[in-house]
């Protein structure tokens, strides 16, 4: 292969060389959420579009039942944006009434589930108080970082209130991961 | 090549191997925007610095006339941050006057233009209501995700109000893409 | 190497091929900050966890004394999220008292230090006015972009007010970089 002569003799390759186009990758986009029961104090997981429009999964990265399934061990960059929208938060109403003012909040968590481990692991959290004076508010929370994942790990996106998620457009709310 | 013996015999390479340093990449930084916008340009595209300071384009990724030009097909990570700043939004003034309260907003869209397709595709959108009680406000909107692009695709960043974009520092407002 | 026959004869490889798993990478997570003296008008740097929980450094990317040390030249994706939290900002109190209204703010800067260069370079900045009506507020600032770095460069994350940083959870405040 041309250029091989540039490889210094001391180079140590710890993993097989591979073509980048062969790496597991996914970009999932929002769909309308079906209201489902979830346990008290547990954030519901979003479900996603995985093949229409901008959404895709490739190279053995599969989406099933709200989870992205990691097909091989390695370091992955994982990202999500959730756009929330709502009416005036209780906070400003309470404030006007002169009662104690605990702000409402919106939260996104990207969670890893490992079958052999009883507790899910929170990889990323974006959380924001919402105390708007406007009657209608909307805003995104964006998250992204790199994590070492194992084959069989599952990733999901949980939110504090599924009814506040803007599901109207695939460019507003999304979730993705790719092997580095 | 040292380490080649670790490559399992069943490895399937779906694309030519290539050096990572050879991949198309760009990081563009904000410049002062020219005010000669068409009066009906309700989502103007930003133009960018592509070679001074932190900005660069490399490996056939070119910047021209507000567009990043994609030189080869593949999966790209695309990102942008736009920092907005303004005076008190009309929203809070309206609120004090007791009139209906539709919040102002700020929006960033990363758009793909394909010459063979008449409609641009919105890849990423960050949109936020702005209803500030302070007399001066400023805040960033960050976006980033992975998309499958084709050779010849063009990328641009559109904003809802070009006059609110903070163009003062290259680290506050930027736009980039790289082939994975 | 299987698949090599797919490599077109005109392919130009400008850098040695290498396994992706061999690239410098780090993901650092928040720890409780020790209050330190810092120069007036200079933002303090955060220090980080580099090996416990979700945190890691690998392939010669080392963390020492608030800095990530870049072990080889190349293009890196660098990211950070800092979650801030505080009590009602002075801004809203001042507003109620009818005094001039300069909003408080929160700022994150990812900074590059090059020993041969006297001035640090600000790579990324996220800055936001905080003028909350709620008594307690919290919100993240996320940053991420690609930069060309040189061997020996050092990266740090600076914040406008270290006392407002939420250090309680590793998924809320973090800092990472990886060679592309």
């Amino acid at each position: 292969l041309k250029g091989q002569e540039f490889a210094p003799s001391h180079q140590q390759v710890y993993a097989p060389l591979r073509a980048d186009g062969d790496k597991p990758r996914a970009h999932l986009t929002v769909v309308r959420q079906t209201p489902t029961q979830h346990f008290k104090n547990q954030f519901p997981a979003l479900h996603w579009e995985h093949e229409l429009g901008l959404a895709f999964t490739k190279n053995r990265m599969n989406y099933t039942n709200k989870f992205l399934l990691i097909p091989e061990s390695g370091d992955y960059f994982i990202y999500s944006q959730v756009t929330f929208r709502g009416m005036t938060s209780e906070c400003s109403e309470i404030r006007q009434a002169g009662r104690p003012n605990k702000p409402d909040s919106i939260t996104v968590v990207i969670t890893k589930v490992t079958d052999s481990y009883p507790e899910p692991t929170q990889l990323l959290m974006g959380t924001k108080s919402v105390c708007e004076v406007g009657s209608n508010w909307f805003q995104p929370i964006y998250l992204g970082a790199m994590f070492s994942l194992q084959e069989g790990d599952k990733l999901m996106v949980n939110v504090s209130d599924i009814s506040l998620v803007d599901y109207t457009k695939e460019d507003k709310t999304f979730f993705g991961a790719f092997l580095l | 090549l040292k380490g080649q013996e670790f490559a399992p015999s069943h490895q399937q390479v779906y694309a030519p191997l290539r050096a990572d340093g050879d991949k198309p990449r760009a990081h563009l930084t904000v410049v002062r925007q020219t005010p000669t916008q068409h009066f009906k340009n309700q989502f103007p595209a930003l133009h960018w610095e592509h070679e001074l300071g932190l900005a660069f384009t490399k490996n056939r990724m070119n910047y021209t006339n507000k567009f990043l030009l994609i030189p080869e097909s593949g999966d790209y990570f695309i990102y942008s941050q736009v920092t907005f700043r303004g005076m008190t939004s009309e929203c809070s003034e309206i609120r004090q006057a007791g009139r209906p309260n539709k919040p102002d907003s700020i929006t960033v869209v990363i758009t793909k233009v394909t010459d063979s397709y008449p409609e641009p595709t919105q890849l990423l959108m960050g949109t936020k209501s702005v209803c500030e009680v302070g007399s001066n406000w400023f805040q960033p909107i960050y976006l980033g995700a992975m998309f499958s692009l084709q050779e010849g695709d063009k990328l641009m960043v559109n904003v809802s109000d070009i006059s609110l974009v903070d163009y003062t520092k290259e680290d506050k407002t930027f736009f980039g893409a790289f082939l994975l | 190497l299987k698949g090599q026959e797919f490599a077109p004869s005109h392919q130009q490889v400008y850098a040695p091929l290498r396994a992706d798993g061999d690239k410098p990478r780090a993901h650092l997570t928040v720890v409780r900050q020790t209050p330190t003296q810092h120069f007036k008008n200079q933002f303090p740097a955060l220090h980080w966890e580099h090996e416990l929980g979700l945190a890691f450094t690998k392939n010669r990317m080392n963390y020492t004394n608030k800095f990530l040390l870049i072990p080889e030249s190349g293009d890196y994706f660098i990211y950070s999220q800092v979650t801030f939290r505080g009590m009602t900002s002075e801004c809203s109190e001042i507003r109620q008292a009818g005094r001039p209204n300069k909003p408080d703010s929160i700022t994150v800067v990812i900074t590059k230090v090059t020993d041969s260069y006297p001035e640090p370079t600000q790579l990324l900045m996220g800055t936001k006015s905080v003028c909350e009506v709620g008594s307690n507020w919290f919100q993240p600032i996320y940053l991420g972009a690609m930069f060309s770095l040189q061997e020996g460069d050092k990266l740090m994350v600076n914040v406008s007010d270290i006392s407002l940083v939420d250090y309680t959870k590793e998924d809320k405040t973090f800092f990472g970089a990886f060679l592309l």
């Epitope: - | 000669t36 916008q37 009906k40 309700q42 233009v113 008449p118 641009p120 919105q122 959108m125 559109n158 | -």
Partner: antibody, heavy 119, light 112 residues
Amino acid sequence: QVQLVQSGSELKKPGASVKVSCKASGYTFTLYGMNWVRQAPGQGLEWMGWINTYTGEPTYADDFKGRFVFSLDTSVSTAYLQISSLKAEDTAVYYCARDTAMDYAMAYWGQGTLVTVSS
Amino acid sequence: DVVMTQSPLSLPVTLGQPASISCKSSQNIVHSDGNTYLEWFQQRPGQSPRRLIYKVSNRFSGVPDRFSGSGSGTDFTLKISRVEAEDVGVYYCFQGSHVPLTFGGGTKVEIK
């Protein structure tokens, strides 16, 4: 695919009001301006003005200031043209037409709404 | 206001033959952003207008390549290289550079 569907024909008496709707689909409504164009029977096209679908700010050509109002309901991706104090000379087909991103002219047109003003 | 004057008013053509329509503006229609927002529209009988050409010479998506636009400053032309039966209708030029935006009076293309 981009579609603009307008409300049906209207027969009105002089002095009455009419509200024509234009429902958009197949794209993000708030990203592109919406124009209104009038065509009197057997006549050419007249640009009435446009509305910024993001901010809601209308712009009217001089001949259409006063009795003509452009409005929006972004929650249902719909633009409206309201004409008050109708006159016989307002009898025409009214078109909504959506701008493009790059050149701000009317690439996509509704099917038109015939408004007839007659006593 | 910018007045757009089209000629001829009526253009009888033979199928398969070329046709040309002229449009003159009363002032230069180059916008301050450097672009000339000159468009051509086709309106077939009983239909909504359809965009053919934008920014003087760019064909809109789906428009056959027998249609072409040219010109600069104040003089513009739409050409049909070989007229087909489906090309019958009224053609309008339009300037989008200066408010108010204005159409030409139209040119009726009919088959001889």
